[in-house]
Structures are given as C-alpha cells and as structure tokens.
Interface confidence: low
C-alpha cells in the first residue's frame, strides 16, 4: 500500500490521543534505554510503512502484536485517513484470524514495540528543512 | 534533569545586534528541537522560530524574518538566538524552550530561565 | 498564519469556583496545547495535545475541544491557581493566544 495520500496530520491527532499511550502501556515495566532503535524511517509515508509492517506481520519470535490495543488503534487510524488501506487490508486479515495464537508477551515483542516507539516518533518529527 | 540555562541580560541600543544563548543538559541535545519564544512587558507569548539540533534546519516567523537567525553548536549542546536591526519593541525577555516530540506532541515541555533583552537610546 | 482567540482576557473568580477558559483557532488545529504562567517566571506545560495533563498537574484541570474550539476546565479553583494560561498550536507553525488571566475576584 502507498501511504503517500493519507493524512498524516489525523494520524497524527491518533497517536497522540490515544497509540502512544497504548504502546507505553504495553512497554511499562521496560527501561527506555533497555533497546536499541535499529529500524528508522525517512519521511512520514516510509514510517507509515515501517509502522504497518512491524504492527501486523508476525516475525520469529513475536507473532502475537496484531490484536493488542495499539494495534487495533492504529488500524482504524490508517483505515480512516489513508484512502483504499482498508481494502488492502482484508485479505491479510482474513489470514490473520486464521493463525491468531495465545497471547504473550515475549522479549522479542517488547523491542519490536520499541522500535515501533521510535518510527512513531520520526513519523511525529519530520526533520526541518536546512535553509 | 533536564535543563536548559540561558545567557544573562543585555541592554542594546537600537539598530545594533543581541545574541542569546541557551545550553541545554540532561538529554541528548540532537534528539529535540529547539524554540525561541519572547514576552514584551504585559504582553502574549510571541514564537520567534524554532531550529532541528539534528541537521540544523530552522523555520521562523515571517514577523522576523531577515531579523532573526537561529544557529546551533552541537558540540556544546548549546542553541543560539540573533536578532539584529534592534528597535525599542524588541524590548523583552526571550525564552529558549525544548519541544518534544514523543507522546505529548510537539509541546514545548522544559523552557529556560529568560533572557532581558532591552533596547534604549 | 493561525490565530488563537483567548477568551475572556480576564476571569474574575473566587477560590471553589468554576473556571472555564475558552481558544478559538481561526482554522482547523489538530490539538491545543495549554501552559501556565506566573508572574516573573517562564510558562509551564500544563496541558499537552488538548486533554493530557502535564506532570505535577492537578486532576482537578481537565481540557477539551477539536476543530477550533478548545476549552481548559478548572472544576475548583485553589489559591494556587490564580495565573495566566496560554493556549498554543503547532498545525501551522506555532502561535500562542493572548492569555486568559485568571484573578481572584
């Protein structure tokens, strides 16, 4: 999906409102400085990518991010403000249900929301243009 | 803690120059931008412009643009504020003020101790 | 250039009473920020993205709003409360509005 027509703004209000405290609620118990950022992003289309895939795509050793609170929030965020995502979205959906697994939260998870944390915040700062 | 500690009062006569500094502590001082911000006597806060520590990108009021230039020396962890062309109304007190960007959005969260900068013939 | 409207300039209320301090944006704005002031001192965050409280921040402050109006609550007011607040926006840049002064009647 291209992230380039949604608007980033609202998705902006979302976050702020209401993902970030999820993804803090989720990492509570975790020091900030516990993980290494490792996974950037150049411009808020790219983060949006990043974030998508790191959200809903299950990865070795954490498969179960998908259905936690931000997640669902984030979602509906893109469904609503980014134009035809929804559509995109049934398909891999309908897949998902299909290997949802029993919820934990591994180590493996708690870094991959850390790196979520940190593209959220560069989706949140683009850079300044130098002058 | 974070901290950021500005320059001490100065007083300018007009069409001359001021440059204030503000060095910041406690956090990673690229990681954050930077604001300027001043408050004439019994006046509203006015934002001046802003700076990205990162790359060194800035954007300002158009009210002071060509008057103000914000620069950085990341090596001292310190922003700098330079307003030239000094008039009687530019008497204020000017204030450096982080602005996170994490959860709370984009709001400045930690400001310095203020700057006087008065201008008198 | 958004321009924040403060209002009223002045609230003249006794310590117990409700306070309701009112910004209006001349366009659209994703969220408000508030800060506090205090005579001789720099401003405060006080109220982040329209709703959060800053830290140290009693519950007894709360905000609201979207689009262009936004509202800072104070459901009783405390000694301590009596200041100026600021609204302020970052959708377009960043402008402040005029201040509400908060004064005991």
């Known amino acids: 999906y291209d992230f380039t027509n949604c608007d980033f703004e609202k998705i902006k209000a979302a976050y702020l409102s209401t993902i970030s405290k999820d993804l803090i609620t989720y990492m509570s118990g975790t020091k900030s400085t516990e993980f290494n950022n490792t996974v950037s992003c150049s411009n808020r289309p790219h983060c949006l990518t990043e974030i998508q895939s790191l959200t809903f795509n299950p990865t070795a050793g954490c498969a179960s991010l998908a259905k936690e609170m931000f997640a669902m929030k984030t979602k509906a965020a893109l469904a609503i403000w980014c134009p035809g995502y929804s559509e995109t979205q049934i398909n891999a959906t309908q897949a998902m249900k299909k290997r949802r697994k029993r919820k934990v939260t591994t180590n493996k998870c708690l870094e991959q929301v850390s790196q979520l944390q940190g593209l959220w915040r560069r989706f949140n700062r683009p850079l300044l243009k130098q002058q | 803690e974070v901290q950021l500690v500005q320059s001490g009062a100065e007083v300018k006569k007009p069409g001359a120059s001021v440059k204030v500094s503000c060095k910041a502590s406690?956090?990673?001082?690229?990681?954050?931008?930077m604001n300027w911000v001043r408050q004439a006597p019994g006046q509203r806060l006015e934002w001046m412009g802003i700076i990205s520590p990162y790359n060194g990108g800035t954007s300002y009021n158009q009210k002071f643009k060509g008057r103000v230039t914000i620069t950085r020396d990341t090596s001292a962890s310190t922003a700098y504020m330079e307003l030239s062309s000094l008039r009687s109304e530019d008497t204020a007190v000017y204030y450096c003020?982080?602005?996170?960007?994490?959860?709370?959005?984009?709001?400045?969260?930690?400001w310095g101790q203020g700057t006087t900068v008065t201008v008198s013939s | 250039e958004i321009v924040l409207t403060q209002s009223p300039a002045t609230l003249s209320l006794s310590p117990g009473e409700r306070a309701t301090l009112s910004c209006r944006a001349s366009?659209?704005?994703?969220?408000m920020h508030w800060y506090q002031q205090k005579p001789g001192q720099a401003p405060r965050p006080w109220i982040y993205a329209t709703s959060n409280l800053a830290s140290g921040v009693p519950a007894r402050f709360s905000g609201s709003g979207s689009g262009t109006d936004y509202t800072l609550t104070i459901s009783r007011l405390e000694p301590e409360d009596f200041a100026v607040y600021y609204c302020?926006?970052?959708?377009?840049?960043?402008?402040f509005g005029g201040g509400t002064k908060v004064e005991i009647k």
């Open positions: 406690g956090y990673t001082f690229t990681d954050d931008y």
């Open positions: 302020q926006q970052w959708s377009s840049n960043r402008t």
């Open positions: 003020a982080r602005e996170d960007y994490d959860y709370d959005g984009y709001a400045m969260d930690h």
């Open positions: 366009s659209s704005v994703s969220y």
